[in-house]
């Protein structure tokens, strides 16, 4: 289990407890409710695909 306050993830990634691995912050526009997005520096700008249902 990931210790609080530590991150094994490279820049641009954040730890996902749900998926038990580092995940790319770039995926947060498409999956904004993912647990790891809370660990990304800022909410990245949306891209077009967010407009799809």
């Amino acid at each position: 289990e990931q210790a609080p306050g530590t991150s094994p993830c490279s820049s641009g990634s954040s730890w996902s407890a749900d998926l038990d691995k580092c995940m790319d912050c770039a995926s947060c526009p498409a999956r904004p409710h993912s647990d790891f997005c809370l660990g990304c520096a800022a909410a990245p700008p949306a891209h077009f695909r967010l407009l799809w249902p």
Partner: antibody
Framework: EVKLGESGGGLVQPGGSMKLSCVAS????????MNWVRQSPEKGLEWVAE??????????HYAESAKGRFTISRDDSRSSVYLQMNNLRAEDTAIYYC??????????WGQGTSVTVSS | DIVLTQSPASLAVSLGQRATISCKAS??????????MQWYQQRPGQSPKLLIK???KLDSGVPARFSGSGSGTDFTLNIHPVEEEDTATYYC?????????FGGGTRLEIK
């Protein structure tokens, strides 16, 4: 280890139907969108359909070439995704792959199942 | 739909040298933060395999001799130094919008 096993391909006549299946293991299936992608010498790699999560009400999206003819579905209890293909045409002849994506990347690919539409 | 044009269609590179493959998109697939472009490798007789995501990030287990760069509409895959096992067809793919589309592929032969 991630495993994806496609099945259900074969030879079918134009206008016929076929249902492809893909059984997945080695990753949290319920958290991943699932895609079908096909590959033919004529058209190369071509995305066909995507199905999202239960929390997205299993939203589906299709390529124009698949709309109205193909239906993607999933069974989370079986870690499986399906592609029902109706009114098949010669141009649907291809190898069909299933692939999970968390958001943008097709992280893993199965070995594919071959579909031939010919009389 | 976004059209991805790869060049060259094929290339032959001597062992240990550099291979450079281009992918041009018909419209931008980048925000100020990220580029939504991926690269895949397909060895003969095998399924595609993810190499690079978000234009420049290597997938886990991919050797460091692979690198990706670019933003907006112009993207590049570099392999240096090339090895025998790099003989394959390489595809770019965008995830900016639906439908996802792929480039036509670049076949790499090692001399």
């Amino acid at each position: 280890e991630v495993k994806l096993g496609e099945s259900g391909g074969g030879l079918v006549q134009p206008g016929g139907s076929m249902k492809l299946s893909c059984v997945a293991s080695g990753f949290p299936f319920t958290k991943y969108w699932m895609n079908w992608v096909r590959q033919s010498p004529e058209k190369g790699l071509e995305w066909v359909a995507e199905i999202r999560l239960k929390s997205d009400n299993y939203a589906t999206h299709y390529a124009e070439s698949a709309k109205g003819r193909f239906t993607i579905s999933r069974d989370d209890s079986r870690s499986s995704v399906y592609l029902q293909m109706n009114n098949l045409r010669a141009e649907d002849t291809a190898i069909y792959y299933c692939s999970p994506t968390y958001a943008d990347t097709m992280d893993y690919w199965g070995q594919g199942t071959s579909v031939t539409v010919s009389s | 739909d976004i059209v991805l044009t790869q060049s060259p269609a094929s290339l032959a590179v001597s062992l240990g040298q550099r291979a450079t493959i281009s992918c041009k998109a018909s419209q931008s697939v980048s925000t100020s933060t990220y580029s939504y472009m991926q690269w895949y490798q397909q060895r003969p007789g095998q399924s595609p395999k993810l190499l690079i995501k978000y234009a420049s990030k290597l997938d886990s287990g991919v050797p460091a001799r692979f690198s990706g760069s670019g933003s907006g509409t112009d993207f590049t895959l570099n392999i240096h130094p090339v090895e025998e096992e790099d003989t394959a067809t390489y595809y770019c793919q965008h995830s900016w919008e639906l439908p996802y589309t792929f480039g036509g592929g670049t076949r790499l032969e090692i001399k």
